[in-house]
Protein backbone atom coordinates (compact mmCIF):
# COMPACT_ATOMS: atom_id res chain seq x y z
CA UNK A 1 0.00 0.00 0.00
CA UNK A 2 0.98 3.63 -0.25
CA UNK A 3 2.45 5.42 2.74
CA UNK A 4 0.93 8.61 4.17
CA UNK A 5 3.87 10.48 2.66
CA UNK A 6 3.01 9.29 -0.88
CA UNK A 7 -0.50 10.65 -0.45
CA UNK A 8 0.93 14.06 0.42
CA UNK A 9 3.22 13.82 -2.60
CA UNK A 10 0.39 13.02 -4.99
CA UNK A 11 -1.60 16.03 -3.77
CA UNK A 12 1.18 18.11 -5.39
CA UNK A 13 0.39 16.66 -8.82
CA UNK A 14 -0.45 19.28 -11.51
CA UNK A 15 -3.84 19.00 -13.20
CA UNK A 16 -4.04 16.44 -16.01
CA UNK A 17 -0.51 15.20 -15.33
CA UNK A 18 0.25 11.65 -14.25
CA UNK A 19 2.21 11.33 -11.04
CA UNK A 20 3.64 8.44 -9.09
CA UNK A 21 6.13 8.02 -6.22
CA UNK A 22 9.62 7.11 -7.36
CA UNK A 23 10.31 4.78 -4.42
CA UNK A 24 12.59 7.27 -2.68
CA UNK A 25 9.87 9.49 -1.20
CA UNK A 26 10.10 11.67 -4.32
CA UNK A 27 7.66 12.19 -7.17
CA UNK A 28 7.76 11.32 -10.88
CA UNK A 29 5.61 13.76 -12.84
CA UNK A 30 4.54 13.09 -16.43
CA UNK A 31 2.96 16.07 -18.15
CA UNK A 32 3.84 15.00 -21.68
CA UNK A 33 1.62 15.46 -24.72
CA UNK A 34 -1.00 17.59 -22.98
CA UNK A 35 -0.93 20.63 -25.30
CA UNK A 36 0.60 22.78 -22.57
CA UNK A 37 1.87 26.20 -23.66
CA UNK A 38 3.54 26.96 -20.34
CA UNK A 39 5.04 25.11 -17.41
CA UNK A 40 2.67 23.90 -14.68
CA UNK A 41 2.81 26.15 -11.64
CA UNK A 42 1.96 23.90 -8.71
CA UNK A 43 4.82 21.38 -8.92
CA UNK A 44 5.80 19.58 -5.76
CA UNK A 45 9.18 20.57 -4.34
CA UNK A 46 9.83 16.83 -4.05
CA UNK A 47 9.67 16.22 -7.82
CA UNK A 48 12.58 14.07 -9.06
CA UNK A 49 11.43 13.53 -12.65
CA UNK A 50 9.48 15.94 -14.83
CA UNK A 51 8.40 15.13 -18.37
CA UNK A 52 7.09 18.11 -20.30
CA UNK A 53 7.87 16.74 -23.74
CA UNK A 54 5.53 16.91 -26.77
CA UNK A 55 3.78 20.08 -25.69
CA UNK A 56 3.55 23.59 -27.19
CA UNK A 57 5.93 25.36 -24.83
CA UNK A 58 7.60 28.12 -26.85
CA UNK A 59 9.46 29.95 -24.11
CA UNK A 60 10.89 29.49 -20.65
CA UNK A 61 11.01 32.38 -18.23
CA UNK A 62 14.04 32.84 -15.98
CA UNK A 63 13.78 30.56 -12.96
CA UNK A 64 10.60 28.78 -14.09
CA UNK A 65 11.10 25.80 -11.78
CA UNK A 66 11.91 27.36 -8.41
CA UNK A 67 12.86 25.15 -5.50
CA UNK A 68 13.05 21.87 -7.46
CA UNK A 69 16.31 21.01 -5.75
CA UNK A 70 15.60 17.26 -6.02
CA UNK A 71 14.86 17.27 -9.76
CA UNK A 72 17.16 14.79 -11.50
CA UNK A 73 15.57 14.51 -14.95
CA UNK A 74 13.86 17.21 -16.99
CA UNK A 75 12.35 16.42 -20.36
CA UNK A 76 11.46 19.33 -22.63
CA UNK A 77 11.78 17.51 -25.95
CA UNK A 78 9.37 18.14 -28.79
CA UNK A 79 8.31 21.63 -27.88
CA UNK A 80 8.71 24.92 -29.75
CA UNK A 81 11.64 26.37 -27.85
CA UNK A 82 13.76 28.76 -29.91
CA UNK A 83 15.69 30.25 -27.02
CA UNK A 84 16.38 29.36 -23.40
CA UNK A 85 17.22 32.30 -21.15
CA UNK A 86 19.87 32.58 -18.52
CA UNK A 87 18.51 31.29 -15.23
CA UNK A 88 16.05 28.87 -16.83
CA UNK A 89 17.54 26.02 -14.82
CA UNK A 90 18.61 27.95 -11.74
CA UNK A 91 18.36 25.97 -8.53
CA UNK A 92 18.25 22.56 -10.22
CA UNK A 93 21.26 21.37 -8.24
CA UNK A 94 20.50 17.67 -8.69
CA UNK A 95 19.76 17.73 -12.42
CA UNK A 96 21.44 14.79 -14.16
CA UNK A 97 19.45 14.44 -17.39
CA UNK A 98 18.28 17.33 -19.56
CA UNK A 99 16.41 16.61 -22.77
CA UNK A 100 15.97 19.48 -25.20
CA UNK A 101 15.82 17.54 -28.46
CA UNK A 102 13.29 18.26 -31.20
CA UNK A 103 12.96 21.95 -30.53
CA UNK A 104 13.98 24.96 -32.63
CA UNK A 105 17.13 26.07 -30.83
CA UNK A 106 19.65 27.84 -33.05
CA UNK A 107 22.43 28.03 -30.47
CA UNK A 108 23.49 25.96 -27.51
CA UNK A 109 21.90 27.73 -24.52
CA UNK A 110 25.26 28.54 -22.96
CA UNK A 111 24.13 30.75 -20.10
CA UNK A 112 21.28 28.46 -19.11
CA UNK A 113 23.62 25.46 -18.90
CA UNK A 114 26.18 27.12 -16.67
CA UNK A 115 26.66 25.58 -13.24
CA UNK A 116 24.68 22.40 -13.93
CA UNK A 117 27.49 20.58 -12.18
CA UNK A 118 25.56 17.32 -11.75
CA UNK A 119 24.45 17.07 -15.38
CA UNK A 120 25.42 13.75 -16.91
CA UNK A 121 23.30 13.57 -20.04
CA UNK A 122 22.41 16.39 -22.40
CA UNK A 123 20.26 15.99 -25.48
CA UNK A 124 20.38 18.82 -28.00
CA UNK A 125 19.71 16.71 -31.08
CA UNK A 126 17.15 17.58 -33.77
CA UNK A 127 17.35 21.34 -33.34
CA UNK A 128 18.70 24.02 -35.70
CA UNK A 129 22.02 24.55 -33.94
CA UNK A 130 24.66 25.97 -36.26
CA UNK A 131 27.02 27.39 -33.67
CA UNK A 132 28.44 26.01 -30.43
CA UNK A 133 30.17 28.76 -28.40
CA UNK A 134 33.68 27.99 -27.13
CA UNK A 135 32.79 28.05 -23.43
CA UNK A 136 29.26 26.64 -23.61
CA UNK A 137 30.01 23.38 -21.77
CA UNK A 138 32.65 24.78 -19.42
CA UNK A 139 30.73 24.13 -16.20
CA UNK A 140 29.48 20.66 -17.11
CA UNK A 141 32.23 18.68 -15.40
CA UNK A 142 30.08 15.57 -14.89
CA UNK A 143 28.74 15.32 -18.44
CA UNK A 144 28.93 11.74 -19.75
CA UNK A 145 26.63 11.76 -22.78
CA UNK A 146 26.11 14.51 -25.34
CA UNK A 147 23.76 14.43 -28.32
CA UNK A 148 24.32 17.08 -30.99
CA UNK A 149 23.13 15.05 -33.95
CA UNK A 150 20.64 16.26 -36.55
CA UNK A 151 21.57 19.92 -36.36
CA UNK A 152 23.23 22.39 -38.74
CA UNK A 153 26.87 22.22 -37.63
CA UNK A 154 29.41 22.75 -40.40
CA UNK A 155 32.49 22.24 -38.27
CA UNK A 156 33.56 20.45 -35.10
CA UNK A 157 33.24 22.80 -32.10
CA UNK A 158 36.77 21.97 -31.00
CA UNK A 159 37.11 24.49 -28.19
CA UNK A 160 33.72 23.71 -26.67
CA UNK A 161 34.72 20.07 -26.23
CA UNK A 162 37.95 20.82 -24.39
CA UNK A 163 36.21 21.00 -21.01
CA UNK A 164 34.42 17.65 -21.37
CA UNK A 165 37.11 15.31 -20.09
CA UNK A 166 34.51 13.01 -18.47
CA UNK A 167 32.47 12.57 -21.66
CA UNK A 168 31.90 8.92 -22.58
CA UNK A 169 29.59 9.07 -25.59
CA UNK A 170 28.89 11.74 -28.16
CA UNK A 171 27.05 11.93 -31.42
CA UNK A 172 27.63 14.59 -34.06
CA UNK A 173 25.86 12.61 -36.76
CA UNK A 174 23.46 14.10 -39.30
CA UNK A 175 25.12 17.49 -39.51
CA UNK A 176 27.03 19.23 -42.32
CA UNK A 177 30.57 18.77 -41.00
CA UNK A 178 33.09 18.63 -43.85
CA UNK A 179 36.47 18.31 -42.12
CA UNK A 180 37.87 17.04 -38.83
CA UNK A 181 40.99 18.97 -37.82
CA UNK A 182 43.97 17.67 -35.86
CA UNK A 183 43.26 17.20 -32.15
CA UNK A 184 39.54 17.89 -32.66
CA UNK A 185 38.78 15.71 -29.64
CA UNK A 186 42.15 16.11 -27.95
CA UNK A 187 40.88 16.28 -24.36
CA UNK A 188 38.19 13.60 -24.58
CA UNK A 189 40.29 10.85 -23.06
CA UNK A 190 37.23 9.09 -21.56
CA UNK A 191 35.18 9.00 -24.77
CA UNK A 192 34.12 5.45 -25.66
CA UNK A 193 31.58 6.07 -28.44
CA UNK A 194 31.79 8.68 -31.20
CA UNK A 195 29.19 8.92 -33.96
CA UNK A 196 30.04 11.05 -37.00
CA UNK A 197 27.88 9.31 -39.58
CA UNK A 198 25.78 11.15 -42.17
CA UNK A 199 27.90 14.24 -42.46
CA UNK A 200 29.84 15.63 -45.42
CA UNK A 201 33.28 14.73 -44.14
CA UNK A 202 35.72 14.58 -47.02
CA UNK A 203 38.99 15.06 -45.16
CA UNK A 204 40.52 14.07 -41.84
CA UNK A 205 43.51 15.67 -40.19
CA UNK A 206 46.37 13.21 -39.76
CA UNK A 207 45.98 13.54 -35.99
CA UNK A 208 42.26 14.24 -35.78
CA UNK A 209 41.59 11.35 -33.38
CA UNK A 210 44.69 11.82 -31.22
CA UNK A 211 43.75 11.91 -27.54
CA UNK A 212 40.81 9.49 -27.83
CA UNK A 213 42.58 6.84 -25.79
CA UNK A 214 39.39 5.09 -24.61
CA UNK A 215 37.50 5.08 -27.89
CA UNK A 216 35.85 1.74 -28.71
CA UNK A 217 33.24 2.69 -31.32
CA UNK A 218 33.79 5.06 -34.23
CA UNK A 219 31.09 5.60 -36.84
CA UNK A 220 32.15 7.40 -40.02
CA UNK A 221 29.49 5.82 -42.22
CA UNK A 222 27.74 7.85 -44.93
CA UNK A 223 30.34 10.54 -45.49
CA UNK A 224 32.45 11.73 -48.44
CA UNK A 225 35.82 10.25 -47.52
CA UNK A 226 38.05 9.65 -50.56
CA UNK A 227 40.90 8.09 -48.64
CA UNK A 228 41.23 5.45 -45.97
CA UNK A 229 41.06 7.12 -42.51
CA UNK A 230 44.67 6.48 -41.42
CA UNK A 231 44.06 8.77 -38.42
CA UNK A 232 42.46 5.77 -36.68
CA UNK A 233 45.93 4.34 -36.04
CA UNK A 234 46.21 5.93 -32.61
CA UNK A 235 42.94 4.31 -31.44
CA UNK A 236 44.43 1.35 -29.63
CA UNK A 237 41.15 0.33 -27.93
CA UNK A 238 38.94 0.55 -31.01
CA UNK A 239 36.53 -2.39 -31.22
CA UNK A 240 33.93 -1.27 -33.75
CA UNK A 241 34.71 0.81 -36.83
CA UNK A 242 32.33 1.90 -39.54
CA UNK A 243 33.23 3.73 -42.71
CA UNK A 244 30.75 2.18 -45.10
CA UNK A 245 29.05 4.31 -47.75
CA UNK A 246 31.98 6.58 -48.50
CA UNK A 247 34.16 6.98 -51.60
CA UNK A 248 37.25 5.05 -50.46
CA UNK A 249 39.07 3.26 -53.26
CA UNK A 250 41.83 1.47 -51.41
CA UNK A 251 42.70 -0.01 -48.05
CA UNK A 252 46.44 0.40 -47.50
CA UNK A 253 49.05 -1.99 -46.15
CA UNK A 254 48.96 -2.21 -42.34
CA UNK A 255 45.63 -0.38 -42.41
CA UNK A 256 44.58 -1.40 -38.90
CA UNK A 257 48.02 -1.81 -37.35
CA UNK A 258 47.14 0.38 -34.34
CA UNK A 259 43.76 -1.24 -33.75
CA UNK A 260 44.42 -4.79 -32.49
CA UNK A 261 41.11 -4.93 -30.57
CA UNK A 262 38.88 -4.55 -33.64
CA UNK A 263 35.91 -6.92 -33.60
CA UNK A 264 33.82 -5.36 -36.36
CA UNK A 265 34.72 -3.33 -39.45
CA UNK A 266 31.96 -2.11 -41.75
CA UNK A 267 33.28 -0.81 -45.06
CA UNK A 268 30.75 -1.97 -47.66
CA UNK A 269 29.44 0.48 -50.27
CA UNK A 270 32.86 1.91 -51.03
CA UNK A 271 34.39 1.61 -54.52
CA UNK A 272 37.31 -0.37 -53.07
CA UNK A 273 39.55 -1.76 -55.77
CA UNK A 274 42.84 -2.29 -53.96
CA UNK A 275 43.50 -3.87 -50.56
CA UNK A 276 47.02 -4.11 -49.18
CA UNK A 277 47.97 -7.71 -48.56
CA UNK A 278 48.90 -6.92 -44.93
CA UNK A 279 45.83 -4.77 -44.30
CA UNK A 280 44.04 -7.30 -42.09
CA UNK A 281 46.97 -8.81 -40.21
CA UNK A 282 47.07 -9.10 -36.42
CA UNK A 283 43.37 -8.61 -35.71
CA UNK A 284 42.78 -11.50 -33.29
CA UNK A 285 39.25 -10.38 -32.35
CA UNK A 286 37.96 -9.89 -35.90
CA UNK A 287 35.07 -12.24 -36.66
CA UNK A 288 33.77 -11.20 -40.09
CA UNK A 289 35.58 -9.89 -43.15
CA UNK A 290 33.73 -9.06 -46.36
CA UNK A 291 35.54 -7.78 -49.46
CA UNK A 292 33.22 -7.39 -52.41
CA UNK A 293 34.31 -6.13 -55.82
CA UNK A 294 37.92 -5.38 -54.95
CA UNK A 295 38.97 -5.98 -58.53
CA UNK A 296 42.65 -5.21 -58.07
CA UNK A 297 43.27 -7.85 -55.43
CA UNK A 298 45.49 -10.47 -57.08
CA UNK A 299 46.77 -12.19 -53.94
CA UNK A 300 44.85 -13.72 -51.07
CA UNK A 301 45.14 -11.41 -48.03
CA UNK A 302 47.77 -12.29 -45.44
CA UNK A 303 45.76 -13.07 -42.32
CA UNK A 304 48.69 -13.72 -40.00
CA UNK A 305 47.52 -13.07 -36.44
CA UNK A 306 43.87 -12.82 -37.52
CA UNK A 307 43.01 -16.30 -36.36
CA UNK A 308 39.41 -16.06 -35.21
CA UNK A 309 37.62 -15.15 -38.42
CA UNK A 310 34.30 -16.93 -38.64
CA UNK A 311 33.25 -15.55 -42.00
CA UNK A 312 35.40 -14.46 -44.94
CA UNK A 313 33.78 -13.25 -48.16
CA UNK A 314 35.87 -12.35 -51.22
CA UNK A 315 34.04 -11.58 -54.44
CA UNK A 316 35.07 -9.94 -57.70
CA UNK A 317 38.77 -10.26 -57.01
CA UNK A 318 41.51 -11.50 -59.35
CA UNK A 319 42.87 -14.20 -57.05
CA UNK A 320 44.10 -17.16 -59.07
CA UNK A 321 45.39 -19.37 -56.27
CA UNK A 322 45.10 -19.82 -52.53
CA UNK A 323 48.22 -20.00 -50.36
CA UNK A 324 48.96 -23.35 -48.78
CA UNK A 325 48.81 -21.76 -45.35
CA UNK A 326 45.25 -20.46 -45.70
CA UNK A 327 43.74 -23.38 -43.80
CA UNK A 328 46.25 -22.96 -41.01
CA UNK A 329 45.44 -19.27 -40.63
CA UNK A 330 41.69 -19.71 -40.29
CA UNK A 331 39.87 -21.63 -37.55
Amino acid sequence: GSSPRSGVLLRGCPTHCHCEPDGRMLLRVDCSDLGLSELPSNLSVFTSYLDLSMNNISQLLPNPLPSLRFLEELRLAGNALTYIPKGAFTGLYSLKVLMLQNNQLRHVPTEALQNLRSLQSLRLDANHISYVPPSCFSGLHSLRHLWLDDNALTEIPVQAFRSLSALQAMTLALNKIHHIPDYAFGNLSSLVVLHLHNNRIHSLGKKCFDGLHSLETLDLNYNNLDEFPTAIRTLSNLKELGFHSNNIRSIPEKAFVGNPSLITIHFYDNPIQFVGRSAFQHLPELRTLTLNGASQITEFPDLTGTANLESLTLTGAQISSLPQTVCNQLP
Partner: antibody, heavy 118, light 111 residues
Framework: QVQLQQSGTELMKPGASVKISCKAT????????IEWIKQRPGHGLEWIGE????????DYNEKFKVKATFSSDTSSNTVYIQLNSLTYEDSAVYYC???????????WGQGTTLKVSS | NIVLTQSPASLAVSLGQRATISCRAS??????????MHWYQQKPGQPPKLLIY???NLESGVPARFSGSGSRTDFTLTIDPVEADDAATYYC?????????FGSGTKVEIK
Amino acid sequence: QVQLQQSGTELMKPGASVKISCKATGYTFSAYWIEWIKQRPGHGLEWIGEILPGSDSTDYNEKFKVKATFSSDTSSNTVYIQLNSLTYEDSAVYYCARGGHYGSLDYWGQGTTLKVSS
Amino acid sequence: NIVLTQSPASLAVSLGQRATISCRASESVDNYGNSFMHWYQQKPGQPPKLLIYLASNLESGVPARFSGSGSRTDFTLTIDPVEADDAATYYCQQNYEDPFTFGSGTKVEIK
Protein backbone atom coordinates in the same frame (compact mmCIF):
# COMPACT_ATOMS: atom_id res chain seq x y z
CA GLN B 1 55.11 5.43 -15.34
CA VAL B 2 55.97 6.70 -18.80
CA GLN B 3 59.65 6.51 -19.69
CA LEU B 4 61.71 6.95 -22.84
CA GLN B 5 65.15 5.37 -22.61
CA GLN B 6 67.68 6.27 -25.28
CA SER B 7 70.85 4.51 -26.34
CA GLY B 8 74.23 5.80 -25.22
CA THR B 9 76.81 8.20 -26.60
CA GLU B 10 78.04 7.52 -30.13
CA LEU B 11 81.43 8.48 -31.54
CA MET B 12 81.41 8.21 -35.33
CA LYS B 13 83.57 9.08 -38.30
CA PRO B 14 82.45 11.40 -41.10
CA GLY B 15 80.59 9.56 -43.86
CA ALA B 16 79.42 6.79 -41.54
CA SER B 17 75.84 6.02 -40.43
CA VAL B 18 74.47 5.67 -36.93
CA LYS B 19 71.23 4.27 -35.50
CA ILE B 20 69.95 5.68 -32.21
CA SER B 21 67.24 3.88 -30.27
CA CYS B 22 64.45 5.07 -27.99
CA LYS B 23 62.65 2.45 -25.88
CA ALA B 24 59.22 3.38 -24.56
CA THR B 25 57.59 1.96 -21.45
CA GLY B 26 54.54 2.74 -19.33
CA TYR B 27 51.97 3.48 -22.02
CA THR B 28 50.35 2.10 -25.19
CA PHE B 29 53.23 2.38 -27.62
CA SER B 30 51.25 2.62 -30.87
CA ALA B 31 48.84 5.28 -29.62
CA TYR B 32 51.27 8.21 -29.49
CA TRP B 33 53.60 9.83 -32.00
CA ILE B 34 57.29 9.89 -31.22
CA GLU B 35 59.14 13.07 -32.15
CA TRP B 36 62.87 13.45 -32.74
CA ILE B 37 64.65 16.67 -31.83
CA LYS B 38 68.23 17.79 -32.43
CA GLN B 39 70.04 20.16 -30.08
CA ARG B 40 73.36 21.78 -30.86
CA PRO B 41 74.97 24.46 -28.70
CA GLY B 42 74.21 27.83 -30.24
CA HIS B 43 71.60 26.34 -32.57
CA GLY B 44 68.78 25.69 -30.11
CA LEU B 45 66.24 22.91 -30.62
CA GLU B 46 65.38 21.61 -34.08
CA TRP B 47 62.49 19.28 -34.92
CA ILE B 48 63.66 16.45 -37.17
CA GLY B 49 60.32 14.72 -37.60
CA GLU B 50 57.93 12.17 -36.16
CA ILE B 51 56.79 8.58 -36.45
CA LEU B 52 53.68 6.76 -35.30
CA PRO B 53 55.11 3.46 -34.00
CA GLY B 54 54.02 0.30 -35.76
CA SER B 55 52.70 2.10 -38.80
CA ASP B 56 54.33 3.59 -41.86
CA SER B 57 53.16 7.05 -40.77
CA THR B 58 56.13 9.40 -40.67
CA ASP B 59 56.66 13.08 -41.20
CA TYR B 60 60.06 14.68 -41.75
CA ASN B 61 61.28 18.22 -41.56
CA GLU B 62 62.30 18.96 -45.16
CA LYS B 63 65.74 19.92 -43.88
CA PHE B 64 66.34 16.37 -42.53
CA LYS B 65 64.57 14.30 -45.21
CA VAL B 66 67.81 13.02 -46.74
CA LYS B 67 69.68 12.82 -43.45
CA ALA B 68 67.25 10.93 -41.18
CA THR B 69 65.15 7.77 -41.41
CA PHE B 70 62.73 6.64 -38.70
CA SER B 71 61.65 3.10 -37.95
CA SER B 72 59.95 1.24 -35.11
CA ASP B 73 59.71 -2.24 -33.61
CA THR B 74 56.47 -2.88 -31.75
CA SER B 75 57.72 -6.16 -30.28
CA SER B 76 60.30 -4.27 -28.22
CA ASN B 77 58.44 -0.89 -28.02
CA THR B 78 61.43 0.80 -29.60
CA VAL B 79 61.73 3.62 -32.12
CA TYR B 80 64.90 4.29 -34.10
CA ILE B 81 66.43 7.17 -35.97
CA GLN B 82 69.14 6.42 -38.51
CA LEU B 83 71.41 9.27 -39.53
CA ASN B 84 73.50 8.70 -42.63
CA SER B 85 76.45 10.35 -44.38
CA LEU B 86 77.51 11.90 -41.12
CA THR B 87 79.28 15.25 -41.08
CA TYR B 88 80.64 17.41 -38.26
CA GLU B 89 77.37 19.38 -38.31
CA ASP B 90 75.54 16.24 -37.18
CA SER B 91 77.36 16.37 -33.85
CA ALA B 92 74.59 17.12 -31.36
CA VAL B 93 72.34 15.74 -28.67
CA TYR B 94 69.39 13.88 -30.16
CA TYR B 95 66.18 13.55 -28.15
CA CYS B 96 63.12 11.42 -28.64
CA ALA B 97 59.91 12.76 -27.10
CA ARG B 98 56.31 11.64 -26.94
CA GLY B 99 53.67 13.73 -28.65
CA GLY B 100 51.13 14.10 -25.86
CA HIS B 101 48.29 16.52 -25.17
CA TYR B 102 47.56 18.37 -28.42
CA GLY B 103 50.98 17.43 -29.74
CA SER B 104 52.95 18.98 -26.90
CA LEU B 105 56.05 16.98 -26.00
CA ASP B 106 55.11 15.62 -22.60
CA TYR B 107 57.86 13.01 -22.01
CA TRP B 108 61.44 13.14 -23.23
CA GLY B 109 64.26 10.69 -23.46
CA GLN B 110 67.48 11.58 -21.65
CA GLY B 111 69.19 12.38 -24.95
CA THR B 112 71.87 10.65 -27.01
CA THR B 113 75.08 12.51 -27.68
CA LEU B 114 76.54 12.01 -31.15
CA LYS B 115 80.10 13.12 -31.82
CA VAL B 116 81.35 13.05 -35.39
CA SER B 117 85.12 13.23 -35.50
CA SER B 118 87.89 11.93 -37.73
CA ASN C 1 58.46 27.94 -41.79
CA ILE C 2 56.99 29.65 -38.76
CA VAL C 3 59.73 31.57 -36.93
CA LEU C 4 59.42 32.00 -33.18
CA THR C 5 61.22 35.00 -31.74
CA GLN C 6 61.81 34.90 -27.99
CA SER C 7 62.70 37.89 -25.85
CA PRO C 8 64.65 38.67 -23.90
CA ALA C 9 67.55 36.34 -24.64
CA SER C 10 68.43 36.38 -20.96
CA LEU C 11 66.81 37.61 -17.81
CA ALA C 12 68.00 38.13 -14.25
CA VAL C 13 65.22 38.05 -11.66
CA SER C 14 65.24 38.42 -7.91
CA LEU C 15 63.76 35.66 -5.76
CA GLY C 16 60.06 36.20 -5.23
CA GLN C 17 59.72 38.57 -8.17
CA ARG C 18 57.93 38.01 -11.47
CA ALA C 19 59.64 36.80 -14.65
CA THR C 20 57.97 37.42 -18.01
CA ILE C 21 59.14 35.83 -21.24
CA SER C 22 57.72 36.70 -24.64
CA CYS C 23 57.40 34.56 -27.75
CA ARG C 24 56.27 36.04 -31.05
CA ALA C 25 55.33 33.85 -34.02
CA SER C 26 55.84 35.00 -37.61
CA GLU C 27 52.25 33.94 -38.34
CA SER C 28 49.24 32.85 -36.36
CA VAL C 29 49.41 29.45 -34.67
CA ASP C 30 45.69 29.39 -33.85
CA ASN C 31 43.36 26.79 -35.31
CA TYR C 32 39.70 26.19 -34.41
CA GLY C 33 40.17 28.30 -31.30
CA ASN C 34 43.22 26.44 -30.03
CA SER C 35 46.64 28.08 -29.87
CA PHE C 36 49.22 25.44 -30.74
CA MET C 37 51.98 26.98 -28.64
CA HIS C 38 53.77 25.16 -25.82
CA TRP C 39 56.43 26.12 -23.26
CA TYR C 40 59.37 24.07 -21.94
CA GLN C 41 62.00 24.43 -19.27
CA GLN C 42 65.50 23.02 -19.75
CA LYS C 43 68.26 22.77 -17.18
CA PRO C 44 71.89 22.01 -18.11
CA GLY C 45 72.49 18.35 -18.91
CA GLN C 46 68.77 17.52 -18.88
CA PRO C 47 66.09 17.20 -21.55
CA PRO C 48 63.43 19.89 -21.82
CA LYS C 49 60.38 19.56 -19.57
CA LEU C 50 56.86 20.52 -20.64
CA LEU C 51 55.36 23.34 -18.57
CA ILE C 52 52.42 24.73 -20.54
CA TYR C 53 50.47 23.30 -23.48
CA LEU C 54 48.07 25.09 -25.80
CA ALA C 55 49.34 28.49 -24.69
CA SER C 56 47.73 28.53 -21.26
CA ASN C 57 47.15 25.00 -19.90
CA LEU C 58 49.35 23.93 -17.02
CA GLU C 59 50.87 20.49 -17.49
CA SER C 60 50.14 18.04 -14.68
CA GLY C 61 52.65 18.30 -11.84
CA VAL C 62 53.92 21.75 -12.82
CA PRO C 63 53.74 24.37 -10.03
CA ALA C 64 50.99 26.97 -10.36
CA ARG C 65 53.52 29.79 -10.29
CA PHE C 66 54.00 29.05 -14.00
CA SER C 67 51.33 30.46 -16.30
CA GLY C 68 50.94 31.06 -19.99
CA SER C 69 48.82 33.45 -22.00
CA GLY C 70 48.35 34.78 -25.49
CA SER C 71 46.86 33.85 -28.83
CA ARG C 72 47.52 34.04 -32.57
CA THR C 73 51.08 35.43 -32.74
CA ASP C 74 51.88 36.81 -29.27
CA PHE C 75 52.49 34.60 -26.26
CA THR C 76 53.84 35.04 -22.76
CA LEU C 77 55.22 32.72 -20.10
CA THR C 78 55.08 34.14 -16.58
CA ILE C 79 56.78 32.81 -13.46
CA ASP C 80 55.43 34.43 -10.32
CA PRO C 81 56.93 34.28 -7.81
CA VAL C 82 60.31 33.09 -9.05
CA GLU C 83 62.08 30.45 -6.96
CA ALA C 84 65.72 29.41 -6.98
CA ASP C 85 64.85 26.16 -8.75
CA ASP C 86 63.51 28.11 -11.74
CA ALA C 87 66.98 29.00 -13.04
CA ALA C 88 66.94 27.43 -16.51
CA THR C 89 66.47 28.12 -20.20
CA TYR C 90 62.87 28.41 -21.41
CA TYR C 91 61.68 27.59 -24.92
CA CYS C 92 58.42 28.13 -26.77
CA GLN C 93 57.39 25.67 -29.49
CA GLN C 94 54.63 25.62 -32.11
CA ASN C 95 53.05 22.57 -33.68
CA TYR C 96 50.47 24.40 -35.73
CA GLU C 97 52.37 23.70 -38.92
CA ASP C 98 55.14 21.42 -40.16
CA PRO C 99 57.98 21.78 -39.55
CA PHE C 100 57.39 22.30 -35.85
CA THR C 101 59.70 25.01 -34.60
CA PHE C 102 61.18 26.22 -31.32
CA GLY C 103 62.11 29.66 -30.10
CA SER C 104 65.79 30.39 -29.54
CA GLY C 105 65.40 30.24 -25.76
CA THR C 106 65.45 32.63 -22.80
CA LYS C 107 67.97 32.03 -20.05
CA VAL C 108 66.62 32.93 -16.61
CA GLU C 109 69.10 33.63 -13.82
CA ILE C 110 68.19 34.23 -10.19
CA LYS C 111 69.72 37.25 -8.51
